[in-house]
């Protein structure tokens, strides 16, 4: 008998899922972009913002070509599930206040969502080490004032605009190895 | 279409060693992790060891460790397992599998018998 | 004992609507790892069904669908039809293992 039959192509290949996590990092760049724009013209902020609960950004972009697939993509993921709960926390905590925002926080949330599946998708297919996740972070505390809150804002914005960015150019140099 | 062609099973007794392949067309087969995956006889599906897509990274099931051995040539397409010291309990269908795994072959009988 | 934990059997009529449940743990369904859906018809190797909890692999009717909630997923089967009766598998990854984990596997059968 003749070889077993084929499998249609049914998913996507690694690299074309590169590609697309590419775009919706490029996407989720513009919408943080975006989304900072309007909070620094709703709630003007002057100097930098820190909070002690962000990830410090994983490197400078001059330091990505020495950098091996795993390391990215793990450093990434945990990185942006970081993102994910306090962009989570400050819609909580900050509901009335950052209404004006609102839609767009929500469509942030849900964007970095599925960029997060994509990622771990990616590293499956790839068959990457997905190391045990963190365990659980004690949860943020609220606010001390609603100015409190908005310099938050202003502080996980501004690291997930870098940490995007990062992103962004990690993924394009790691598309070239792959 | 995708094909993963496994091939190397048969009879072999307990103690002994066997050479699984597994020969891969149809996709970019560099671009993939690979995974063994078996199945005993009227039983569940157990994976076994997966081998990521350059081979730099190689895992295994607790209950094959230091014993069976995953490697891959990407300039042959083709995924290996080498199985020593082989035991009654490996008995099992083994399949190749690529990425989550999205594709699997046909799959390869192992009989560990005296 | 498997680490997802399937119902060993379910059972419907052509036409009906099916549910197959699979539980995990905090270390791998939820711990934002996808759960995937394998379909394994009579004597032949496992198809991917479900992917990333509820995307549908090109070619696979969309009487299929998944869903993910907390430390569970679940496969739907809607309009059952005979050739449905296979045994379905959810798998998930679990980072300890560095590799998937399968359910023990559910028996469908149409009555």
């Known amino acids: 008998p003749g070889p077993p039959p084929g499998s249609p192509r049914a998913s996507p290949d690694p690299r074309a899922e590169l590609d697309s996590t590419v775009l919706l990092t490029r996407s989720l760049l513009e919408d943080t972009r975006q989304l900072t724009i309007q909070l620094k013209d709703k709630f003007p902020a002057d100097g930098d913002h820190n909070l002690d609960s962000l990830p410090t950004l994983a490197m400078s972009a001059g330091a990505l070509g020495a950098l091996q697939l795993p390391s990215v993509l793990t450093r990434l993921r945990a990185d942006l599930l970081s993102y994910l709960r306090h962009v989570q926390w400050l819609r909580r905590a900050m509901g009335s206040s950052l209404k004006t925002l609102e839609p767009e926080l929500g469509t942030l949330q849900t964007r970095l969502d599925r960029l997060l599946r994509r990622l771990q998708l990616l590293m499956s297919r790839l068959a990457l080490p997905q190391l045990p996740p963190d365990p659980p972070a004690p949860p943020l505390a609220p606010p001390s004032s609603t100015w409190g809150g908005i310099r938050a804002a202003h502080a996980i914005l501004g690291g997930l605009h870098l940490t995007l960015d990062w992103a962004v150019r990690g993924l394009l140099l790691l598309k070239t190895r792959l | 279409e995708v094909q993963l062609l496994e091939s190397g099973g048969g009879l072999v007794q307990p103690g002994g060693s066997l050479r699984l392949s597994c020969a891969a067309s149809?996709?970019?087969?560099?671009?993939?992790?690979m995974h063994w995956v078996r199945q005993a006889p009227g039983k569940g599906l157990e994976w076994v060891a997966v081998?990521?897509?350059?081979?730099?990274?190689?895992y295994y099931a607790d209950s094959v460790k230091g014993r069976f051995t995953i490697s891959r040539d990407n300039s042959k397409n083709t995924l290996y397992l080498q199985m020593n010291s082989l035991r009654a309990e490996d008995t099992a269908v083994y399949y190749c599998?690529?990425?989550?795994?999205?594709?699997w072959g046909q799959g390869t009988l192992v009989t560990v018998s005296s | 004992q498997s680490v997802l934990t399937q119902p060993p059997s379910a059972s419907g009529t052509p036409g009906q609507r099916v549910t197959i449940s699979c539980s995990g743990s905090?270390?791998?369904?939820?711990?934002?790892?996808?759960v995937h859906w394998y379909q394994q018809l009579p004597g032949t190797a496992p198809k991917l069904l479900i992917y990333?909890?509820?995307e549908r692999p090109s070619g696979v009717p969309d009487r299929f669908s998944g869903s993910k909630s907390g430390t569970s997923a679940s496969l739907a089967i809607s309009g059952l039809r005979s050739e449905d009766e296979a045994d379905y598998y959810c798998?998930?990854?679990?980072?300890?293992?560095?590799?998937?984990?399968f359910g023990g596997g559910t028996k469908l059968t149409v009555l």
């Open positions: 599998a690529a990425g989550v795994p999205d594709y």
């Open positions: 149809g996709f970019t087969f560099s671009s993939y992790g």
């Open positions: 081998i990521s897509y350059d081979g730099s990274y190689k």
């Open positions: 905090s270390s791998n369904i939820g711990s934002y790892y996808d």
């Open positions: 990333s909890n509820e």
């Open positions: 798998a998930a990854w679990d980072p300890s293992l560095y590799g998937p984990v």
